[in-house]
């Protein structure tokens, strides 16, 4: 595998992260495959101090980030436990409100413009944020 | 200068076999993410496959899921596509195209001659 | 599935016309759109991206224009290299998808 040691261009580097910060709109899976096209994910959010370094770098706009809840549960994309790890949700949030008219509920979790977070239609487009870990080997798969 | 030559086209007959090769060179191969796009004869493009540059996320059309296997060599900067139970519509020309990644999205800045596989019995 | 609609399906045109070539997404891409040229036997080349942005090298005769579902590739004077194929392209998301294409050929 090969390790990545600095951020690629236009990527911020934080924490031994890189992240990048989208200024248009997508769908949260199409935002989804675009961080993994990229060898990143859609962020997750572990600590007070992400939080306040992301919502600083989208500032009071609607923003996808990695956790939705369309198998049943809460879930990360990247694997980090939801039920034991940091939330920062809206009160009385999420709600899986089925009253936009849409269709279904809602599984997709966003920023919104106070920073705080909120479950929403992930069809709906909004930004995003990429993340990827610095000094991760990235495993390449066995070459058949 | 980026360069990137395709191999491995060739006359197969239907369910059988064929690995497709991408040797590129000219720009940091295993920072960037590739795809593979046919063509069938007189007829438009069609995008295949796509992968990332550490080879850990691939992407495929419906019309070759399960069929088809993209993946990558970094050491030796190339692009392969393993393509098994060939039909005859999969007859076409196959590019290897680079990506690139732009305010957001990914389109396909350089393109491959293009290797030829047919499928016949 | 996206699907990309192109027209018109071919175009005639002499050197120094004024050539438009519209695509029409199945639903709202954004500006995710790419526009390539082709020549018989040859592989696609990248013309515009983002739907307005010049790929490095491209004359500047060429431009993309358009948001949304509806966009526009336009030559502002033909000349005798652009004869060719053109295809518009969405990479708003997978599978990424291909209008028809429009083949520019001389009147």
């Known amino acids: 595998g090969s390790e990545r040691t600095c951020c690629p261009v236009n990527w911020v580097e934080h924490e031994r992260s890189c992240y990048w910060f989208s200024r248009s709109g997508k769908a949260w899976a199409d935002a989804d495959n675009y961080c993994r096209l990229e060898d990143a994910h859609l962020v997750v959010v572990t600590s007070w101090e992400e939080q306040k370094f992301v919502q600083h770098h989208i500032g009071p706009v609607n923003t996808w980030m990695g956790l939705h809840d369309q198998n049943g549960p809460w879930k990360w994309v990247d694997g980090t436990d939801y039920e034991t790890g940091f939330k920062n949700w809206r009160p009385e949030q999420p709600d899986d409100w089925y009253g936009h008219g849409l269709g279904g509920g809602e599984d997709c979790a966003h920023f919104t413009d106070d920073g705080r977070w909120n479950d929403d239609v992930c069809q709906r487009p909004y930004r995003w944020v990429c993340e990827t870990e610095l000094d991760k080997a990235s495993q390449e798969p066995p070459l058949l | 200068e980026v360069q990137l030559l395709e191999s491995g086209g060739d006359l197969i007959q239907p369910g059988g076999s064929l690995r497709l090769s991408c040797a590129a060179s000219?720009?940091?191969?295993?920072?960037?993410?590739m795809s593979w796009v046919r063509q069938a004869p007189g007829k438009g493009l069609e995008w295949v496959s796509a992968i990332s540059g550490s080879g850990g996320n691939t992407f495929y059309a419906d019309s070759v899921k399960g069929r088809f296997t993209i993946s990558r060599d970094n050491s030796k900067n190339t692009l392969y596509l393993q393509m098994n139970s060939l039909r005859a519509e999969d007859t076409a020309v196959y590019y290897c195209?680079?990506?690139?990644?732009?305010?957001?999205?990914?389109?396909?800045?350089?393109w491959g001659q293009g290797t030829l596989v047919t499928v016949s019995s | 599935d996206i699907q990309m609609t192109q027209s018109p399906s071919s175009v005639s045109a002499s050197v120094g016309d004024r050539v438009t070539i519209t695509c029409r997404a199945s639903?709202?891409?954004?500006?995710?759109i790419a526009w390539y040229q082709q020549k018989p036997g040859k592989a696609p080349k990248l013309l515009i991206y983002g739907a307005s942005s010049l790929q490095s090298g491209v004359p500047s005769r060429f431009s993309g224009s358009g948001s949304g579902t509806d966009f526009t590739l336009t030559i502002s004077s033909l000349q005798p290299e652009d004869f060719a194929t053109y295809y518009c392209?969405?990479?708003?998301?997978?599978?990424?998808?291909f209008g028809p294409g429009t083949k520019v050929d001389v009147k």
């Open positions: 000219g720009f940091t191969f295993s920072s960037s993410a």
């Open positions: 639903q709202g891409i954004s500006s995710w």
């Open positions: 392209q969405q990479s708003n998301s997978f599978p990424f998808t």
């Open positions: 195209a680079k990506l690139i990644a732009v305010v957001g999205s990914h389109y396909f800045d350089y």
